[in-house]
Interface confidence: medium
Amino acid sequence: GDQVEQSPSALSLHEGTDSALRCNFTTTMRSVQWFRQNSRGSLISLFYLASGTKENGRLKSAFDSKERRYSTLHIRDAQLEDSGTYFCAAEASSGSWQLIFGSGTQLTVMP
């Protein structure tokens, strides 16, 4: 089946620094979502993109509009509360109903 490759699997940042998470898709995707997992294990939706970029505070997400084969999540001025696990998920263009998840990025922000 279609696959989502998320990188890096783990990331340590110092408070106040910037970084980016990336997801590569083995086929063209119709849309992409970025989530953050809360302490109870529930997923909080950060972004939903069908193309282009979206920004929310210190977070910015982009989805390659041409090839539709990758997406990035940029974190600016990382704060301690940004620590957690981030997931991307993509919806296949085939319309077969499947949302396919990346394996997650464990982000640790250090003081």
Epitope: R30, S31, Y48, S96, W97, L99
Partner: antibody
Framework: QVQLQESGAGLVKPGASVKLSCTAS????????MHWVKQRPEQGLEWIGR????????KYDPKFQGKATITADTSSNTAYLQLSSLTSEDTAVYYC??????WGQGTTVTVSS | DIELTQSPAIMSASPGEKVTITCSAS?????MYWYQQKSDASPKLWIY???NLAPGVPARFSGSGSGNSYSLTISSMEGEDAATYYC?????????FGGGTKLEIK
């Protein structure tokens, strides 16, 4: 947050039609596919079909062809399921879903005279 | 249509017990998806692509299988696992579901 809210059900008479709506928030339905699933009381799940709201293309399980009609209105960000010639077999909870992650809470149709 | 048969239809397990639910396909499928549904709630994606746990699903769950035979396993049953589990195939339209397995806690 992505949310799907179904409405439009209730008690309907045999032979009548009903139109269920599924209003989306947190995303544009034209960027995805919208699906409908049926669940009869104490029974399993049945995929009815889906629509590509960007162009109106639909795909159905053949057993729901003629019974179900899926449409969408991108201006109101809403997908619809119309069920015709209702019988007791159509008594069920109907769910709309985006991909297989985001599901509505379900809406109940009860067919009874 | 590809028919999916789940077994058992109903089962109960004690806390700590290992649980296996099987899903048998009438034709070979490429992979299987699993959902958990609790009473009066919408189904939740639980396992995708046969063996990948959806985010937030406890590690005691696992999925395996190929061809015509797939399974969902709980290594050590917990009270919160009591629910109905459905398998679903995406190999051939229409996307069919299994009849469900109702798992109860003893």
């Amino acid at each position: 947050q992505v949310q799907l809210q179904e409405s439009g059900a209730g008690l309907v008479k045999p032979g009548a039609s009903v139109k269920l709506s599924c209003t989306a928030s947190g995303f544009n339905i034209k960027d995805t596919y919208m699906h409908w699933v049926k669940q009869r009381p104490e029974q399993g799940l049945e995929w009815i079909g889906r629509i590509d709201p960007a162009n109106g293309n639909t795909k159905y399980d053949p057993k729901f062809q003629g019974k179900a009609t899926i449409t969408a209105d991108t201006s109101s960000n809403t997908a619809y399921l119309q069920l015709s010639s209702l019988t007791s077999e159509d008594t069920a909870v109907y769910y709309c879903a985006r991909a297989n992650w985001d599901w509505g809470q379900g809406t109940t149709v009860t067919v009874s005279s | 249509d590809i028919e999916l048969t789940q077994s058992p239809a109903i089962m109960s397990a004690s806390p700590g017990e290992k649980v296996t639910i099987t899903c048998s396909a009438s034709s070979s499928v490429n992979y299987m998806y699993w959902y958990q549904q609790k009473s009066d709630a919408s189904p939740k994606l639980w396992i995708y692509y046969t063996s990948n746990l959806a985010p937030g699903v406890p590690a005691r769950f696992s999925g395996s299988g190929s061809g015509n035979s797939y399974s969902l396993t709980i290594s050590s049953m917990e009270g919160e696992d009591a629910a109905t589990y459905y398998c679903q195939q995406f190999t051939s339209s229409p996307w069919t579901f299994g009849g469900g397995t109702k798992l109860e806690i003893k």
